[in-house]
C-alpha cells in the first residue's frame, strides 16, 4: 500500500463506540485527532493506530493510517494526529516524481563521471562529469569504470501529505 487514500479507505467510523471521546466543535471545526459527527454537534476522536487527522477539520471520517510497504521501514507509528512515517530501505530511494515505490539506487556512475552525492532514502546517487562538473541525468550507469556508492544515510519522512 502507498500513502495515498482512496474514498473506499474512508469507511465510516463506529460513531457510538464507547472508546471514542467526544467534544464540541469550535466554529464548526474539530481539532487535530478528531473528526466531526454527521449532525455537526460533536467532535469524535480518531482511533489510535487506525486513523488520524492532522489539522482543524470538518471531516466526516478520520483518515486511515498508511501501512508501510515491503521495502520500507517505519520511522514513526501512526497516532491520532499524525500519519505513519515510512522511509525507503537502505540502498533504495523515493523520488518526488514517482512517489509510489522505492527504487534501487544506482551502484555507480557512468564512465567519465564522479560521484558527488550518496544514495539516500529520498535521492539516487549524484554523478557529475569530471571536467565540466555538470550533473548526469541518465538512468543506467555504464558497466565499465563504475564508482561504487556507499549505502544510504538516514532519514527523511516519505509520507506524502505531511
Amino acid at each position: 500500500e502507498s500513502a495515498l487514500i482512496t474514498q473506499q479507505d474512508l469507511a465510516p467510523q463506529q460513531r457510538a463506540a464507547p472508546q471514542q471521546k467526544r467534544s464540541s466543535p469550535s466554529e464548526g471545526l474539530c481539532p487535530p485527532g478528531h473528526h466531526i459527527s454527521e449532525d455537526g454537534r460533536d467532535c469524535i476522536s480518531c482511533k489510535y493506530g487506525q486513523d488520524y487527522s492532522t489539522h482543524w477539520n470538518d471531516l466526516l471520517f478520520c483518515l486511515r493510517c498508511t501501512r508501510c510497504d515491503s521495502g520500507e521501514v517505519e520511522l514513526s507509528p501512526c497516532t491520532t494526529t499524525r500519519n505513519t512515517v515510512c522511509q525507503c530501505e537502505e540502498g533504495t530511494f523515493r523520488e518526488e516524481d514517482s512517489p509510489e515505490m522505492c527504487r534501487k539506487c544506482r551502484t555507480g556512475c557512468p564512465r567519465g563521471m564522479v560521484k558527488v552525492g550518496d544514495c539516500t532514502p529520498w535521492s539516487d546517487i549524484e554523478c557529475v562529469h569530471k571536467e565540466s562538473g555538470t550533473k548526469h541525468s541518465g538512468e543506467v550507469p555504464a558497466v565499465e569504470e563504475t564508482v561504487t556508492s556507499s549505502p544510504g544515510t538516514p532519514a527523511s519522512p516519505c509520507s506524502l501529505s505531511g
Epitope: I5, T6, I36, L59, F61, L63, E96, L160, S161, G162
Partner: nanobody, 125 residues
C-alpha cells in the same frame, strides 16, 4: 497536465473579506485533492486550507480557523477560499495547489503536484 489560475486577490482593510478563486484547466479535478498555501514577504510558504475531494471534508490551519472557508465546484473545476475578518498577518501571495489523487489533504508543499502562479492579498488600514 493541470494549469491553475488564481484570481480575487487585492487590497482590503482589516476586518474585511475577499473570495479567492482557482480555475483548473487541462483535466477534471473532481478526484483530485486541492488546497491553498500562502507566502508572506520574507517568510516560507505555509499551509492554509485543503479539501480532500468533493463533500469529503476540509482541513484548516489554526491561524485561519473560523475565518476562512474552503469550497470547490467540481463541475466548474474551481476551488474557492472565502476569507473574512482579515488581519494584517494574512497579507501574502496565495497559491492554489492540486495533487494527482484524492489522497489525504495537501498539508505540506511536498504533497502538491501542481501550483498556480499566486494572487496577492494585502490587508492594510
Amino acid at each position: 497536465e493541470v494549469q491553475l489560475l488564481e484570481s480575487g486577490g487585492g487590497e482590503v482593510q482589516p476586518g474585511g473579506s475577499l473570495r479567492l478563486s482557482c480555475a483548473a484547466s487541462g483535466r477534471s479535478i473532481s478526484n483530485y485533492a486541492m488546497g491553498w498555501f500562502r507566502q508572506a514577504p520574507g517568510k516560507e510558504r505555509e499551509f492554509v486550507s485543503a479539501s480532500v475531494w468533493n463533500n469529503g471534508g476540509n482541513y484548516y490551519a489554526e491561524s485561519v480557523k473560523g475565518r476562512f472557508t474552503i469550497s470547490r465546484d467540481d463541475a466548474k473545476s474551481t476551488l474557492y477560499l472565502q476569507m473574512s475578518s482579515l488581519r494584517a498577518e494574512d497579507t501574502a501571495v496565495y497559491y492554489c495547489v492540486v495533487a494527482r489523487t484524492p489522497e489525504t489533504p495537501i498539508t505540506s508543499a511536498r504533497g502538491a503536484n501542481y501550483w498556480g502562479q499566486g494572487t496577492l492579498v494585502t490587508v492594510k488600514p
